[in-house]
């Protein structure tokens, strides 16, 4: 009965999911059989939390769009642990939007989830953040500094990296 | 007032090249990205690329990749969109159009005349 | 890279009709979607954003509707400057791809 309840409970929990990811790639947590974290397929994982790269070139509020219908948000990085993780998809040619703006332009920096803009955990390039018509955050490559933020116009098209929390069956 | 004013006809030939200018004034050129956009006579519209003025950044429809470059001026705030390798179904209005607040193209300039024909 | 199927190609009315021009994209839009007029000579003229938002200065008897994939834009009433080309842009991902056009001319 137990085992069949739990059944029960994960199969809806997996139909909540199936419309934007009707695939998932769960591994065991742990030594319990019965807990399983989940990201959706191709999505990668680390810690807590899963990751997708969009390819598609959008304005930073097409790309918070385009990551919240797949029930997720653009990357809030919280350590350069996760930042090293990030950066082993991406591509040195190209940039991405990271869920962090400046909507005012007053050098305001907020993440999309509300997580507290903590000065001592950027990793922004040298020089950078140094335009107040340049109000979204990317991450590129610069040979001379390796990964780096670096401020944008939000409406210059660029890809995108999407987070969610892991789904937990 | 928000005005973009472009260079005039050209006529080129078969493999050349042919740069395009659109002038802004009435509000801060650094600020708003400029789209390129051209229509075949009789035909629709279709959409080339864009740049942001204020650092140079630009992204390209993927069909002019490697024969568009769009630059700008910031000095006379002034937009170029230069096509190379001219071929005849380059003949076409070409028009720049300012991308305002809302993420939509609120200018244009008046078009310019680009005939390609040897 | 989206594609936009504009319908009809083009029609034919008279003043005081009431004309209906839809928009199809091959993916969703998300209402990125913008309606301009175009008469000849002439650059294009934005009428509506966001699908349904009115740009300024745009008389009250043009609207439009629609979500996903599907898009209409109307003219409740039409009036004689209203004879034109009506061409939809989307705008949620690069290239911005443009609708084929509906020639709206006078029967």
């Known amino acids: 009965n137990f085992m069949y309840s739990k059944t029960v409970k994960r199969l809806s929990k997996l139909r909540e999911y199936q419309q934007y990811h009707p695939s998932l790639t769960c591994v065991m947590e742990g030594k319990d059989i019965e807990d399983w974290s989940c990201c959706p397929t191709p999505w990668t994982s680390f810690q807590s939390s899963c990751y997708f790269i969009s390819t598609g070139m959008q304005s930073w509020t097409k790309s918070q769009k385009n990551c919240s219908v797949m029930g997720a948000d653009l990357v809030v990085i919280n350590t350069r642990e996760e930042q090293d993780f990030i950066i082993q998809n991406l591509k040195r040619n190209s940039s991405y939007f990271l869920g962090l703006s400046d909507p005012g332009g007053r050098r305001h920096w907020q993440w999309v989830d509300q997580t507290p803009y903590n000065e001592n955990v950027t990793f922004w390039h040298s020089g950078e953040p140094n335009n107040l018509d340049e109000r979204c955050a990317i991450i590129n490559f610069r040979s001379s500094e390796e990964w780096g933020w670096n401020d944008i116009h939000c409406h210059v098209p660029q890809k995108s990296i999407c987070k969610m929390k892991k789904i937990y069956i | 007032q928000v005005q973009l004013v472009q260079s005039g006809a050209e006529v080129k030939k078969p493999g050349a090249s042919v740069k395009v200018s659109c002038k802004a004034s009435?509000?801060?050129?650094?600020?708003?990205?400029i789209h390129w956009v051209r229509q075949a006579p009789g035909q629709g519209l279709e959409w080339m690329g864009t740049?942001?003025?204020?650092?140079?950044?630009?992204s390209y429809n993927q069909k002019f990749k490697g024969r568009v470059t769009m630059t700008r001026d910031t000095s006379t705030s002034t937009v170029y969109m230069e096509l190379s390798s001219l071929r005849s179904e380059d003949t076409a209005v070409y028009y720049c159009?300012?991308?305002?607040?809302?993420?939509?193209?609120?200018?244009w300039g008046q078009g310019t005349l680009v005939t390609v024909s040897s | 890279d989206i594609q936009m199927t504009q319908s009809p190609s083009s029609l034919s009315a008279s003043v005081g009709d009431r004309v209906t021009i839809t928009c199809r994209a091959s993916?969703?839009?998300?209402?990125?979607l913008a309606w301009y007029q175009q008469k000849p000579g002439k650059a294009p003229k934005l009428l509506l954003y966001?699908?349904?938002t009115l740009a300024e200065g745009v008389p009250s008897r043009f609207s439009g509707s629609g979500s996903g994939t599907d898009y209409t834009l109307t003219i409740s009433s039409l009036q004689p400057e209203d004879f034109a080309t009506y061409y939809c842009?989307?705008?949620?991902?690069?290239?911005?791809?443009f609708g084929g056009g509906t020639k709206v001319e006078i029967k």
């Open positions: 966001d699908a349904e």
């Open positions: 993916g969703n839009i998300h209402n990125y």
């Open positions: 009435g509000y801060t050129f650094t600020s708003y990205l």
């Open positions: 740049i942001y003025p204020g650092r140079g950044d630009t």
């Open positions: 842009q989307h705008f949620w991902s690069t290239p911005y791809t």
């Open positions: 159009a300012r991308m305002g607040d809302n993420e939509y193209f609120d200018y």
